[in-house]
């Protein structure tokens, strides 16, 4: 199974200090992965290469994303990417890419969380994306 | 074979101007790769996807890591990641990720070297890690 | 098929506001991919993991690369990497890595474009490279 996703939108819930991205498939092979709004549901357990990139346009001193999984009654951070940002708005433009190999369980929900309220993201599909490759 | 490693600790030997990370397996499939202190020994020769991320909290003007291999009487750099760092300690927080596909030989020892003495690293397993996927 | 490429040189054509890299193979397995000067020709259609890193030594406020494909009468950006750069030449040293999974067609030409005239790149094979893995 292979899935490459691109953004639909990004939102911060009221009173939330995080921003989440809603995803749609751009490339899909196999039935083992299912985009579900702000998350991706794992249908086939196994070892996956996960990758995530977010394009930030924000002068907050550091920006980044956390890729986490929720399932079997617990939430767990898998990996994160962190980027220091310039304080000048014209210069504050950085993509942050990270990836890793993880064992995912059936029913796990994977999501990308930016731990900032109303983070300024560029939701171009070339700059912000999320992907899975079953190994 | 698949191996995803996370840090145990990082040290600079006396009189050394480099910092090395000691690794432990977080995910392992197959017997082709063996964590050995500061290095990973290749048991099965072949083509591997290697990935490395280090999370830096250091105001040194540029930081980064080198992934190198030692074996068969030679030592060489495979790839490196470089990140310019802000001079203010509160802002100096950057992950540096890189990856590539390389042919590794039986007996090769792979290691991650930060070419700075006593580099200030964040050894969280979500921010600093090393991985191998046999293709 | 697997292909890992390293730079031969990088050039900006007269009156062009982009810099392109010319590539040579460092590792090749299979016949599905062919280095062709500034591009890589896809011989075997399929789903590929593509990765790109460029090492920048440039004080231009933001630098980065675009990985694009040309084929079937159209040009398309697949993904890009963006890095804000310090204004001081001694600090302006950043690698920019990105990757993703894409469906490539037979005859597609893949290239790495830096959308700056005469971009200052470090063409070390350890810092600037391009790769493909057929999944």
């Amino acid at each position: 199974s292979v899935l490459h996703l691109v953004p639909i939108n990004a939102t911060s819930k009221d009173d939330s200090d995080v921003t989440e991205v809603m995803w749609q498939p751009a490339l899909r092979r196999g039935r083992g992965l299912q985009a579900q709004g702000y998350g991706v549901r794992i249908q086939d357990a196994g070892v996956y290469l996960l990758y995530s990139q977010v394009l930030f346009q924000d002068v907050t001193f550091t920006m980044g994303q956390v890729v986490s999984r929720e399932g079997q009654g617990r939430q767990e951070t898998l990996f994160r990417c962190i980027r220091s940002m310039p304080s000048h708005p014209d210069r504050a433009y950085n993509s942050c890419y990270s990836a890793g190999v993880f064992h995912l369980h059936q029913g796990d929900i994977l999501s990308v969380i930016i731990p900032r309220a109303r983070a300024k993201l560029n939701l171009s599909p070339h700059g912000t994306f999320l992907g899975f490759v079953k190994l | 074979s698949v191996l995803h490693l996370v840090p145990i600790n990082a040290t600079s030997k006396d009189d050394s101007d480099v910092t090395e990370v000691m690794w432990q397996p977080a995910l392992r499939r197959g017997r082709g790769l063996q964590a050995q202190g500061y290095g990973v020994r290749i048991q099965d020769a072949g083509v591997y996807l290697l990935y490395s991320q280090v999370l830096f909290q250091d105001v040194t003007f540029t930081m980064g890591q080198v992934v190198s291999r030692e074996g068969q009487g030679r030592q060489e750099t495979l790839f490196r990641c470089i990140r310019s760092m802000p001079s203010h300690p509160d802002r100096a927080y950057n992950s540096c990720y890189s990856a590539g596909v390389f042919h590794l030989h039986q007996g090769d020892i792979l290691s991650v070297i930060i070419p700075r003495a006593r580099a200030k690293l964040n050894l969280s397993p979500h921010g600093t890690f090393l991985g191998f996927v046999k293709l | 098929s697997v292909l890992h490429l390293v730079p031969i040189n990088a050039t900006s054509k007269d009156d062009s506001d982009v810099t392109e890299v010319m590539w040579q193979p460092a590792l090749r397995r299979g016949r599905g991919l062919q280095a062709q000067g500034y591009g890589v020709r896809i011989q075997d259609a399929g789903v590929y993991l593509l990765y790109s890193q460029v090492l920048f030594q440039d004080v231009t406020f933001t630098m980065g690369q675009v990985v694009s494909r040309e084929g079937q009468g159209r040009q398309e950006t697949l993904f890009r990497c963006i890095r804000s750069m310090p204004s001081h030449p001694d600090r302006a040293y950043n690698s920019c890595y990105s990757a993703g999974v894409f469906h490539l067609h037979q005859g597609d030409i893949l290239s790495v474009i830096i959308p700056r005239a005469r971009a200052k790149l470090n063409l070390s094979p350890h810092g600037t490279f391009l790769g493909f893995v057929k999944l």
Epitope: - | S68, G73, Q75, E76, T77, H103 | A26
Partner: antibody
Framework: QVQLVQSGAEVKKPGSSVKVSCKAS????????IHWVRQAPGQGLEWMGW????????NYAQKFQGRVTITADKSTSTAYMELSSLRSEDTAVYFC?????????????WGQGTLVTVSS | EIVMTQSPATLSVSPGERATLSCRAS??????????LHWYQQKPGQAPRLLIY???TRATGIPARFSGSGSRTEFTLTISSLQSEDFAVYYC?????????FGGGTKVEIK
Amino acid sequence: QVQLVQSGAEVKKPGSSVKVSCKASGYTFTDYTIHWVRQAPGQGLEWMGWIYPLRGSINYAQKFQGRVTITADKSTSTAYMELSSLRSEDTAVYFCARHGAYYSNAFDYWGQGTLVTVSS
Amino acid sequence: EIVMTQSPATLSVSPGERATLSCRASESVDNDGIRFLHWYQQKPGQAPRLLIYRASTRATGIPARFSGSGSRTEFTLTISSLQSEDFAVYYCQQSNKDPYTFGGGTKVEIK
């Protein structure tokens, strides 16, 4: 562009030592091993050993073990080869060479050579 | 150690002719599909220059008239049409096993 520039010719007495330098420029010095190769007059090429400047790791050919010392100064991007207990058969041109790592596995750049003459 | 043997020791060729140089290793210099065999050119008073690496890949700036072939223990350097600047000594070298070793060289001279 990549350059390796070596120190000048030396004349030495038997039993003494010689230290030859090799200054690298045009690339990241710590990323590549520097090797030393010598060539006696009218003879072929003989490999002596290498240093990986990033870590200071070294490897010497068995023939020269105990007599050769290869070092590197990262601050000046310079490698050094010192050969001790010199004898007349050590008269040769000594070359430093950069090893092109995984993508060539060969000596892709060479210094111009340093002639060392051992004579009483 | 791996012993590299080059033949002939001297090759006399006229300009424009083809030259074929041989290099034999005492044991295989192939490792996991990679051929750790390289060719260098050396002119009098100069350092060697890399021509061919990994048995068959031309180094940057090397003309297409130079080509390399072979595997395991038998390798060949071919110069398709000798130019005046090609008259020199050619060395093969293996980097599969420590210590790295060179062949004794083939001198290509004008006939």
